[in-house]
Interface confidence: low
């Protein structure tokens, strides 16, 4: 497999309305026309997909319709957002991204942004 | 219709050089990865290198970078492959071969060959 | 680079015979790897690709398995037309390489 170095934020704390957004940067090898960048998240050594998307260079990323996750690309950056996070939703956000086109294929794994998720406290009861 | 058409049968003597060239129509030249592959008689297939037209960007297998060159002109949609310092090992049918554009790859289409006869 | 070794480098089969033919990279493709067909005189012609998935026209006799360093074409009932020479290729960084070829003769 053909190694390439993806870099993201260690750590990411969430709005309050449950929004988190980092970085995802990877160091192409050659000059990437397709790449797919997929969300995986991690707790409790269980490792998920989140969402992922496949977009041609200078296009904007298209996840699905119902998908909690958008985004944007730059260069080699992408920035991505994921929204309607809880608290239980609180681990290791992996940003893994793959040059699909043209070949050789390459694959980069980042070390994860753990992205920390809080409830808002409810509204007390207000009296009128 | 995808469409290869490639040149001619070709005599060469030892030492010279020869042009191969491979015709595209039927889809948009400009965004596939145009390969060469060869066939020495009874022999196996080799593959030599390839082109990306939009900006002619190259990747050359090493046993052939100091001999081949391979070009393309997007207006006639035709890519080229040259080999230089000819020797009785290069006879051989040349063959172009478009590359899918997606993971995985392939070639799809292929043109009808060219037979080239190094001889003096 | 990564060598293909294919086997057998001959074969010969009877119509209707199921046949199978392997192809063993010197090292991991990820199945990245396509199998084509070749007669006399002619050019190759793609089988399958990605290892598994059969190309357009191919008829569904012709089918694929494997993945790592362990890829298998099988035709599952020979027909006439099918005696030519076989070819395992992988596009896993080029150069891309070929098998040497197995050549499928009549019994």
């Known amino acids: 497999c053909k190694a390439m170095h993806v870099a993201q934020p260690a750590v990411v704390l969430a709005s309050s309305r449950g929004i988190a957004s980092f970085v995802c940067e990877y160091a192409s090898p050659g000059k990437a026309t397709e790449v797919r960048v997929t969300v995986l998240r991690q707790a409790d050594s269980q490792v998920t997909e989140v969402c992922a998307a496949t977009y041609m260079m200078g296009n904007e990323l298209t996840f699905l319709d119902d998908s909690i996750c958008t985004g944007t690309s730059s260069g080699n950056q992408v920035n991505l957002t994921i929204q309607g996070l809880r608290a239980m939703d609180t681990g290791l956000y992996i940003c893994k991204v793959e040059l699909m086109y043209p070949p050789p294929y390459y694959l980069g794994i980042g070390n994860g942004t753990q992205i920390y998720v809080i409830d808002p406290e409810p509204c007390p009861d207000s009296d009128f | 219709e995808v469409q290869l058409v490639q040149s001619g049968a070709v005599v060469a003597k030892p030492g010279s050089s020869v042009k191969v060239s491979c015709k595209a129509s039927g889809y948009s030249f400009t965004t596939y990865w145009m390969n060469w592959v060869r066939q020495a008689p009874g022999q196996g297939l080799e593959w030599m290198g390839m082109i990306h037209p939009s900006d002619s960007e190259t990747s050359l297998n090493q046993a052939f970078k100091d001999r081949v060159t391979i070009t393309a002109d997007k207006s006639t949609s035709t890519a080229y492959m040259e080999l230089s310092s000819l020797t009785s090992e290069d006879t051989a049918v040349y063959y172009c071969?478009?590359?899918?554009?997606?993971?995985?790859?392939?070639?799809?289409?292929w043109g009808q060959g060219t037979t080239v006869t190094v001889s003096s | 680079d990564i060598q293909m070794t294919q086997s057998p480098s001959s074969l010969s089969a009877s119509v209707g015979d199921r046949v199978t033919i392997t192809c063993r990279p010197s090292e991991n493709l990820y199945t990245n790897l396509a199998w084509y067909q070749q007669k006399p005189g002619k050019a190759p012609k793609l089988l399958l690709y990605?290892?598994?998935n059969l190309a357009d026209g191919v008829p569904s006799r012709f089918s694929g398995s494997g993945s790592g360093t362990d890829y298998t074409l099988t035709i599952s009932s020979l027909q006439p037309e099918d005696f030519a020479t076989y070819y395992c290729?992988?596009?896993?960084?080029?150069?891309?390489?070929f098998g040497q070829g197995t050549k499928l003769e009549i019994k």
């Open positions: 990605g290892a598994t």
């Open positions: 071969a478009r590359m899918g554009r997606r993971n995985p790859y392939y070639f799809d289409y």
């Open positions: 290729q992988h596009l896993w960084g080029t150069p891309f390489t």
